[in-house]
C-alpha cells in the first residue's frame, strides 16, 4: 500500500476518505486506527456501527468521527479541532472476524494556523456542544508518498 498524505490546519477539521471495492468488502465493518511505530500495532481509534446495515450512521470517539457509505464504497473519517498531536500514520481497515485488511495507509500532517497571529476573538473555535455536522470541514489536501519516500523516519 502507498501512503496517502492528508494535510489539515490546526484547529480546523480534516476529512480523510478511503475508497474501497464495495462488493469485495460487502458486510464488513470498518475501522480507523493509529499506527504506533513502523512495526508496532495499529491502535483502534473508532469503528463503524456494530450493525453493518447501519454503517452510514456517524460514530464518534472524542474528536474523531467515522461514517461508511457501504453502497458507494467510501469510508470517511473526520478529525475535528485538529491538533499537532493528531499528526502521524493511520490506517483505514476492513474488519472480518479477528482479522483486518488495510484499505488505505494515511499520513496526517497538521499545518500551523495562518491566522494564529490574530486575536483569539477573530478565531472561530467549535464549541463542545456543536455536532460534527455543524463543524466546518476544510477541503483536505492529499497526495501519495512518492516511491522512495520513507513513511517512517529511520530510528537511530
Amino acid at each position: 500500500h502507498n501512503t496517502t498524505v492528508f494535510q489539515g490546519v490546526e484547529g480546523q477539521s480534516l476529512q480523510v476518505s478511503c475508497p474501497y471495492d464495495s462488493m469485495k468488502h460487502w458486510g464488513r465493518r470498518k475501522a480507523w486506527c493509529r499506527q504506533l511505530g513502523e512495526k508496532g500495532p495499529c491502535q483502534r481509534v473508532v469503528s463503524t456501527h456494530n450493525l453493518w446495515l447501519l454503517s452510514f450512521l456517524r460514530r464518534r470517539n472524542g474528536s474523531t468521527a467515522i461514517t461508511d457509505d457501504t453502497l458507494g464504497g467510501t469510508l470517511t473519517i473526520t478529525l475535528r479541532n485538529l491538533q499537532p498531536h493528531d499528526a502521524g500514520f493511520y490506517q483505514c481497515q476492513s474488519l472480518h472476524g479477528s482479522e483486518a485488511d488495510t484499505l488505505r495507509k494515511v499520513l496526517v500532517e497538521v499545518l500551523a494556523d495562518p491566522l494564529d497571529h490574530r486575536d483569539a476573538g477573530d478565531l472561530w473555535v467549535p464549541g463542545e456542544s456543536e455536532s460534527f455536522e455543524d463543524a466546518h470541514v476544510e477541503h483536505s489536501i492529499s497526495r501519495s508518498l512518492l516511491e522512495g519516500e520513507i513513511p517512517f523516519p529511520p530510528t537511530s
Epitope: 460487502w26 456501527h49 453493518w52 446495515l53 447501519l54 452510514f56 453502497l71
Partner: antibody, heavy 126, light 106 residues
Framework: EVQLVESGGGLVQPGRSLRLSCTAS????????MSWFRQAPGKGLEWVGF??????????EYTASVKGRFTISRDGSKSIAYLQMNSLKTEDTAVYYC?????????????????WGQGTMVTVSS | DIQMTQSPSSLSASVGDRVTITCQAS??????LNWYQQKPGKAPKLLIY???NLETGVPSRFSGSGSGTDFTFTISSLQPEDIATYYC????????FGGGTKVEIK
C-alpha cells in the same frame, strides 16, 4: 393505504419451526428495510432482526438471542418479508410484529420504524 | 449492550397536565433515540425520531429532547387518547428499548 399484515403465528412445541409472513401494500416494498420485533406477554419490546432494502441484496442482522435460529428473508415480487424460526424455545413466546424502517434516499434508511403490522401471536409450549 | 432506563415505570395525570418521561442510556448515544406510543392490544406507533424530530402526522403536543445519555419525552397537555405505554429506543449500538412508561388518567 400503507399497510403491513403479519400471519403464520400459532401454537408450536419447543424445538419445532414456524414461518411468519409480513405482507406489505401501499408502498414500494423494495425501497425499504424491514424489521421484526417481538413482545412477550406483559413485557416490553425487543428487536429481533432486520433485512436491508433491495439495494442491500438481502443482507440481514439479528439480535444475539436468535442468531443462528431465526432467518429473515424477503420476496420482492410478492412484497412479503418472512421470519423463519427454527429450534423454538418457550422464551420465544411473544407477539411478533413486522415494521418498516424510515427511508432517507436510495439505499439509505433510518432505524426508526414508521409503519407496523398488527402483530401475530406465537406460543411455544409443550 | 446499551441499557435504557426509563422512568417512571407508570404515572397517573389529569387531562391537560404536562407529562414528562425520562430515558437514560448506559453510555453516550448522541441523539440516536426514538420514542414510540403503544396502546393496549395495538402495535407501537413512532412519535419522535433522532431524539427531537416529530414524526409526520403526530400532534405537536408531543416533543422530545436530550443528547448523550439523558433524554426527555413530553406531552404538553395530556389528552384522553394519550393513554398508552411509551417506549424509548436507541440505535447507537444494536437496537434496544427502554422498559416502558404506562400513562393513565387520574
Amino acid at each position: 393505504e400503507v399497510q403491513l399484515v403479519e400471519s403464520g403465528g400459532g401454537l408450536v412445541q419447543p424445538g419445532r419451526s414456524l414461518r411468519l409472513s409480513c405482507t406489505a401494500s401501499g408502498f414500494t416494498f423494495g425501497d425499504y428495510a424491514m424489521s421484526w420485533f417481538r413482545q412477550a406477554p406483559g413485557k416490553g419490546l425487543e428487536w429481533v432482526g432486520f433485512i436491508g432494502s433491495k439495494a442491500y441484496g438481502g443482507t440481514t442482522e439479528y439480535t444475539a438471542s436468535v442468531k443462528g435460529r431465526f432467518t429473515i428473508s424477503r420476496d420482492g415480487s410478492k412484497s412479503i418479508a418472512y421470519l423463519q424460526m427454527n429450534s423454538l424455545k418457550t422464551e420465544d413466546t411473544a407477539v411478533y410484529y413486522c415494521a418498516r424502517g424510515k427511508r432517507y434516499s436510495y439505499g439509505y434508511w433510518h432505524p426508526a420504524f414508521d409503519v407496523w403490522g398488527q402483530g401475530t401471536m406465537v406460543t411455544v409450549s409443550s | 449492550d446499551i441499557q435504557m432506563t426509563q422512568s417512571p415505570s407508570s404515572l397517573s395525570a389529569s387531562v391537560g397536565d404536562r407529562v414528562t418521561i425520562t430515558c437514560q442510556a448506559s453510555q453516550d448515544i448522541t441523539n440516536y433515540l426514538n420514542w414510540y406510543q403503544q396502546k393496549p392490544g395495538k402495535a407501537p406507533k413512532l412519535l419522535i425520531y433522532d431524539a427531537s424530530n416529530l414524526e409526520t402526522g403526530v400532534p405537536s403536543r408531543f416533543s422530545g429532547s436530550g443528547s448523550g445519555t439523558d433524554f426527555t419525552f413530553t406531552i404538553s397537555s395530556l389528552q384522553p387518547e394519550d393513554i398508552a405505554t411509551y417506549y424509548c429506543q436507541q440505535y447507537d449500538s444494536y437496537l434496544t428499548f427502554g422498559g416502558g412508561t404506562k400513562v393513565e388518567i387520574k
